[in-house]
Interface confidence: medium
Amino acid sequence: QPPPPPPDATCHQVRSFFQRLQPGLKWVPETPVPGSDLQVCLPKGPTCCSRKMEEKYQLTARLNMEQLLQSASMELKFLIIQNAAVFQEAFEIVVRHAKNYTNAMFKNNYPSLTPQAFEFVGEFFTDVSLYILGSDINVDDMVNELFDSLFPVIYTQLMNPGLPDSALDINECLRGARRDLKVFGNFPKLIMTQVSKSLQVTRIFLQALNLGIEVINTTDHLKFSKDCGRMLTRMWYCSYCQGLMMVKPCGGYCNVVMQGCMAGVVEIDKYWREYILSLEELVNGMYRIYDMENVLLGLFSTIHDSIQYVQKNAGKLTTTIGKLCAHSQQRQYRSAYYPEDLFIDKKVLKVAHVEHEETLSSRRRELIQKLKSFISFYSALPGYICSHSPVAENDTLCWNGQELVERYSQKAARNGMKNQFNLHELKMKGPEPVVSQIIDKLKHINQLLRTMSMPKGRVLDKNLDEEGFESGDCGDDEDECIGGSGDGMIKVKNQLRFLAELAYDLDVDDAPGNSQQATPKDNEISTFHNLGNVHSPLK
């Protein structure tokens, strides 16, 4: 073993190094001292360190460690934050498009139902957005409210346009009749199933991404214990006290120290792995009725089909409702049922469909692939940090926490540390409370992700078939029952042109087939229907 360099009689080198951390000379001895008051950098002879310097080194070491941890997680953090924001915005765009397609369907096929239909559709999709973002809203209630609101308008505008204003108090009766008589057939239930499944999955997907951010943020801002600070100080700074400025810590020694400091953090590893694999499973199942893009962009078509179903049965319904709601009316009114064709605008509205452009689905899969490259992030952290901080290559001529050694020996280093403090003891203390909390949250989200794992094979419950869909109501596989039908439909494929759309606001006035320009972004809010937390100023 090479002899240590002669001590610096004036502590000049140590002083100039220390001044970078702490301007001023007051804490550095002018000449080497016995150092009997030192607690971390225990000297074997005279030393150029004081107790105050040691404290400063500890503080700096912990700050260094926090910065190293933050830079280690920067790429992962950015990946999740960026994707959470992108997906949240993308989901909002899907909702906005779905609303606009639905409004366009009403505008082109049932102009007499607007603007009330716009209002009900707007409220429904506002609830959809809120649900995705975590609001405590029941999807079935949302769908029921949509159909409950629509039916009185359909009845008074399409089926019985002869009703005078004085008869509008039958609305409550009509809302009740809507469910009792199943006037829309099984379409509301179908929509409930599709919307609740797709939104539940979307919501948990966003929840999981946001929890991912929380996990990284928690570990990113961990405050390291004093014991860890002492270990880091010994590794990074105690060599300075002996005038060994250019010596690097041994690699093996760094790993031991980092494992000790990160013992609590590494405990996240098991749950983090499970999180990524569960998220992958969720994403793999996000198709057909578990894909909100697919479901919501096809909703207008199912709603259109449901109105056609009402029209098909208008004669029978008008008679029944006439009796059921008779007490609400002064007299019976003639049914004004017309052949379905009169309600269909024959214009075919087209939405561009680009087969190979990036979709939400491909973006999700891409995210999972990137996340999987971070599956060992927590278990690999100690090694990562050591590889990104100065350590001696091949463990030769390096600092082992006590002295300069030609080759690092873990056993020797451990023996030398016995009097100072026990690494094993540090590991046994268990994780920080914040780490325990985040582990609990990971366990919870993993459980949720597992319960959300999609059934294989046929997707919808069989009981939908038993509820009596007439042939032609929806097709053989209800799972697919979200596409367009009828000439008046907007042809929509499940291909949201994802990134291109992010900067684009489609509104009713921009809806396919409508040339009216919106200026500037005229779709935003209406004085009458969408004033947030103010009472409607309607007269």
Epitope: P115, T126, Q517, P520, T527, G532, V534, P537
Partner: antibody, heavy 115, light 112 residues
Amino acid sequence: EVQLVQSGAEVKKPGASVKVSCKASGYTFSDYEMHWVRQAPGQGLEWMGAIHPGSGDTAYNQRFKGRVTITADKSTSTAYMELSSLRSEDTAVYYCARFYSYAYWGQGTLVTVSA
Amino acid sequence: DIVMTQTPLSLPVTPGEPASISCRSSQSLVHSNGNTYLQWYLQKPGQSPQLLIYKVSNRFSGVPDRFSGSGSGTDFTLKISRVEAEDVGVYYCSQSIYVPYTFGQGTKLEIK
């Protein structure tokens, strides 16, 4: 090109009513709310109310306590603002403006209330 | 009613110099849909008001890029990077989220 053309200046006696028209062109009249804003001489802008021509829905500034009535005629793409029980302080330029953001304004109609 | 307070009420500026107008609302103008409905208008002498900025920071088409809007919640600012002679007039901020919609008192920009 979106255009809002208002009726000409009016001179009225206190207690009378005035009806100002605003003819819209260059867009689908029934798709956009029409709002009315007034400006007394040397003063700022004051919102009076609005109508959605498509639905007939109206909203009013309660400050006018039922003196203002806004209507729309879809067949002629024209909106109307009628102000009754005129007082001298109602002397102002009355503007129609298309919502949202009032990107388009009429040229204004000066209503003078004088005994 | 929402009160919109503008400062200053008068703003003498030398051509080529920047100018800044502040507008404060008595309540947040953030809608539940996330947008903030604050507009800025310029009314030149003898003309109707013209839209400059909508939703806090979006320049209306045809508005020179020397005009910019910023702010959030209740505090908003209109900035003109280099004032030109044609910019004289009264500037108004306005909210269109709560009925009745309201305007600021106006800021008169004049050339020194």
